[in-house]
């Protein structure tokens, strides 16, 4: 996260008109003092002295943890996933007790054939990762299994996974309707009982960048927001430059307070600046007003 570089000036004046010396400390910010041994340091906002410097808690930084960062690191997962709990009834295999033992040759063979069959069924779904048999039971063989889906994180990941789960439902319904026994014989890799196909549960990865941003911003949660760049979420305050929500302080420095972002205007040798965005410049010598 980029911190705003302070402007090199004699003083900064807030947009309300008061002169504030740098580095500025927002008087509304809660102040705590951290003491380690006989070393007393003014580490504010929950920061602690490590013997050399203040270790600041998010979202603070600075020598005394008095300033608020302009952006907070939020790290969405690289990939997001969904797990569908399904049940199908395989009629081309008769149940035997050995199928309950996951280390038996029967189970291993069934698992291999079932996995092959499902890989064929779901071959057109880019999010499809594989299947995992959780339980086999009598009737001919009732197969309780998970279908695993995965996709790269994007802001639209939920829609992508929701769509994929719908395609899984369509495809499993189709194959279990088409691949059925004829004259007690199966000509397909596996045959199914059409009525035995059920979707028991769907679990989708929950990740909300807005929620993570708000949590990390703590008492500044109302002023930090999420903006996207190249499908990646950024948790920023208006003081972070280069975003749609960025505040333009023109001739001044943006600073966060508990009332939101404000501009601290520059006073130079020739001008002083005022206004909410420090865009009103007054020349000192001629008292001439520029816009």
């Amino acid at each position: 996260p980029l911190a705003t570089i302070p402007v090199s000036t004699t003083s900064l004046t807030s947009s309300e008109g008061s002169t504030i010396s740098t580095p500025s400390v927002d008087i509304s910010t809660p102040v705590t003092t951290s003491i380690v041994g006989d070393q007393c340091s003014r580490c504010k906002n929950g920061g602690f002295w490590d013997g050399l410097k203040c270790q600041c808690l998010t979202p603070y930084y600075g020598e005394s943890c008095e300033e608020v960062v302009n952006s907070i690191d939020i790290a969405p997962p690289e990939t997001v996933s969904a797990q569908m709990e399904l049940t199908v009834t395989v009629t081309s295999v008769k149940f035997t007790d050995e199928l309950k033992n996951h280390s038996s040759q029967e189970f291993r063979e069934f698992n291999k054939t079932f996995t092959e069959q499902m890989n064929i069924v779901y071959s057109g779904i880019p999010e499809y990762v594989g299947v995992n048999i959780t339980n086999l039971r009598l009737g001919s063989v009732v197969v309780e299994h998970d279908v695993l889906l995965r996709t790269k994180y994007t802001p639209e990941y939920k829609t992508a996974l929701d769509n994929a789960t719908e395609v899984v439902k369509q495809k499993i319904t189709k194959v279990t309707t088409e691949q059925i026994m004829t004259n007690d014989n199966c000509s397909a890799l596996m045959c199914f009982n059409t009525t035995g196909t059920q979707v028991q549960n769907i679990t989708v990865t929950q990740y909300d960048p807005v929620e993570e941003c708000r949590q990390k911003a703590e008492e500044y949660e109302d002023y930090f927001l999420v903006e996207y760049r190249d499908q990646k979420p950024y948790c920023i305050s208006p003081c972070e430059s280069g975003f749609n929500a960025s505040k333009n302080c023109n001739h001044g420095k943006c600073q966060m307070s508990q009332n939101g972002a404000r501009c601290l205007c520059v006073t130079t040798e020739t001008h002083w600046y005022s206004g909410e965005d420090c865009n009103q410049g007054t020349q000192k010598s001629h008292h001439h007003h520029h816009h």
């Epitope: 009629t91 081309s92 295999v93 008769k94 149940f95 035997t96 050995e98 038996s104 040759q105 029967e106 063979e109 069934f110 291999k112 054939t113 092959e116 026994m181 007690d184 014989n185 199966c186 000509s187 397909a188 890799l189 596996m190 045959c191």
Partner: nanobody
Framework: EVQLVESGGGLVQPGGSLRLSCAAS????????MSWFRQAPGKEREGVAI???????GYADSVKGRFTISQDNAKNSLYLQMNSLRAEDTAVYYC?????????????????WGQGTMVTVSS
């Protein structure tokens, strides 16, 4: 390790009979299934007959009433008695085994295979 070895193939006249055998090792006949498949030149492998440890037998429509599948558990052997043979029965005949009690004559459903024995029906 499952090993299957077929024998009994050869040249026979149309209308004649032939008995194929398959000796199995590493496989128990009292569990799972065994089957016969065949592959004619330039064609896909197709199911001929199947027998399961629960006593169930199944046949392809093209051989029903002419072929009989059987097994001898004591000898760990599988047999295919082929009667009223036709020219279209000419193929390499394969023995296949599965630890599952199968009802499938799709070759992809079978995991263990023999090398095959050639049956030629010609006058």
């Amino acid at each position: 390790e499952v090993q299957l070895v077929e024998s009994g193939g050869g040249l026979v006249q149309p209308g004649g009979s032939l008995r194929l055998s398959c000796a199995a090792s590493g496989f128990t006949f009292s569990r799972g299934s065994m089957s016969w498949f065949r592959q004619a030149p330039g064609k896909e492998r197709e199911g001929v007959a199947i027998i399961s440890s629960d006593g169930w037998t199944g046949y392809a429509d093209s051989v029903k009433g002419r072929f009989t599948i059987s097994q001898d558990n004591a000898k760990n052997s599988l047999y295919l008695q082929m009667n009223s043979l036709r020219a279209e029965d000419t193929a390499v005949y394969y023995c296949a085994a599965s630890f599952l009690v199968l009802r499938a004559l799709n070759p992809k459903a079978w995991h263990y295979w023999g090398q095959g024995t050639m049956v030629t029906v010609s006058s």
